[in-house]
Amino acid sequence: KSPIFGPEEVNSVEGNSVSITCYYPPTSVNRHTRKYWCRQGARGGCITLISSEGYVSSKYAGRANLTNFPENGTFVVNIAQLSQDDSGRYKCGLGINSRGLSFDVSLEVSQGPGLLNDTKVYTVDLGRTVTINCPFKTENAQKRKSLYKQIGLYPVLVIDSSGYVNPNYTGRIRLDIQGTGQLLFSVVINQLRLSDAGQYLCQAGDDSNSNKKNADLQVLKPEPELVYEDLRGSVTFHCALGPEVANVAKFLCRQSSGENCDVVVNTLGKRAPAFEGRILLNPQDKDGSFSVVITGLRKEDAGRYLCGAHSDGQLQEGSPIQAWQLFVNEESTIPRSPTVVKGVAGGSVAVLCPYNRKESKSIKYWCLWEGAQNGRCPLLVDSEGWVKAQYEGRLSLLEEPGNGTFTVILNQLTSRDAGFYWCLTNGDTLWRTTVEIKIIEGEPNLKVPGNVTAVLGETLKVPCHFPCKFSSYEKYWCKWNNTGCQALPSQDEGPSKAFVNCDENSRLVSLTLNLVTRADEGWYWCGVKQGHFYGETAAVYVAVEERKAAGSRDVSLAKADAAPDEKVLDSGFREIENKAIQDPRLFAEEKAVADTRDQADGSRASVDSGSSEEQGGSSR
């Protein structure tokens, strides 16, 4: 499929001008290659009319130009002094005319309307309101006022001052007679339809002395705005329908076959299943405007979209609308990344998030899509060291591996973590990507004790058992804080006995904390990685208490305090029942979602200093 995109149809009137924008992927080659506009012949072939290399056909001399905008990946063809001879099939394209890097455009130039003298022209958008003003003389002030529409050769009554309304206009038309001082009546037609277009005649009086005024009503179907976005990227439709529909239900729909327009999302709570997890309808302003964000763009998302307002929350005749033609460029600069990541209860996931390399200095975010109402995506973590309180100790955003990708790790998974998450930055909004986390049956691969209590001044050893499947991976322990997880020294204690059917390649790697201090309290993770690519992690909360009896503590899986809702099995391993392993004193639901801040002279969340209090809350 050609990645070139432009308007499928362009309509204009003799004597007018048109401006045609064609989009192309802004690669280095494309930016500098020849751009052209050619007319398709009856026997195939395409005759160049104008190109970016300076050629202008004699047919276009003095009335056309072609301008390339390489930074936007667009070029624009302007054609003036149109005649009906210009109607036809054209191509805008790159390179050689016959090569196929082009887009077909149909140009239709119609004759201007043949209007009677003294005809007032009203040009109004579909779904909007028109007011036709009809002046009259004093002698007709008390006489019948009427509006007719010319249908073929005959005028058909639309409305009159005696109360008649043509059935085609019921509920959307009124006739207003101004105060006695003004010799004027007006007819207001709402929710204009395409079929309302035509010649009207307003009349005051019925005899030969009646006052008449001709009006020509043109109802414009909105020209779709062209939108060119990358596969896997995102698009935002900004819909401004005007304050008169501020309190009417809004919708975005996608045109399917014929005139059908399938609702994608509306303010009445409807959402198409294909857009689950990747759409937001941002609430409307007082002036009735709203926006819809769609992320994780797919090939099949391409097409014509309409936004509108109607009490039913879907397209009806007379809905005011705005239109877009979305083209999804399959030659995407956005790299493929998994759209579904699976994890087990008690286990973890590591999500790779792509971003635009040019924006390495931007703030990175991860948010959880919520489908309630019109969809929203509250942030959970950012690259500046903020983590939402409920996720402390089990969520981290790492700038690694860098160069266009960051990593998000979420552990202590429960069934409540299943859902859609968005990767985004505060830079190029087109690079939002979506990932669905699914919680599947199974056991976590890494085995660690439950919550552990260390004694001030003593030594603590915490084991982590790695199955043989991770034999080629780097194994690590780290201490979690808001800014990431600071690596700590660990000891390989040889093969682990924690796995059935697992050979000598399984491993027991221990974390040792010597001379435990209050600053050692907190969350510790053990995990695996390959270079800068992170795999599974497991979390342990280490509490610190006053000395009771001397000696060091060597924590085994069986001896560790079982976290709430856990059973200690005979084998010495924990069975985690869909609950996050948390310090019992810090249940997220009970914890105030504070957003405290480190002081100017302190660090945001230091591994080496600071008390447990400084680690708590939603600190940053």
Partner: nanobody, 130 residues
């Protein structure tokens, strides 16, 4: 305690210029991105511009692009907003803020709230009128 104090607002004619300042204290200013947000009379909050911690990554709302310039001096713990070619529609109370906590990015038009940022200043009034 985090404190953000804006200054530099005032009355200016269309086409004129103003420079807003925001003095920050109570946190490690040089480590966080900062934001300018405004609220026009009778309207909702509107995000204006963002600068990252190092001052080397900057973005603007379309409505101010090419006219406003955000900058920061980490040695002085101060954020700036240089506003040129001012228009009547720039009339608003301007706030500096830090720690975006809202729903997705950019802050969706018409939905931005004070709660979407960790800390706010008290604001400075900018009036553009002839």
């Amino acid at each position: 305690e985090v404190q953000l104090v804006e200054s530099g607002g005032g009355l200016v004619q269309p086409g004129g210029s103003l420079r807003l300042s925001c003095a920050a204290s109570g946190f490690a200013f040089s480590r966080y991105g900062m934001y300018w947000v405004r609220q026009a009379p009778g309207k909702g909050l509107e995000w204006v511009s963002t600068i990252n911690s190092g001052g080397d990554y900057i973005i603007y709302a379309d409505s101010v692009k090419g006219r406003f310039t955000i900058s920061r001096d980490n040695a002085k713990n101060t954020l700036y907003l240089q506003m040129n070619s001012l228009k009547p529609e720039d009339t608003a109370v301007y706030y500096c803020a830090e720690g975006y906590r809202g729903s997705e990015w950019p802050p969706p038009a018409f939905t931005l709230q004070r709660a979407d940022f960790a800390s706010w200043g008290q604001g400075t009034q900018v009036t553009v009128s002839s």
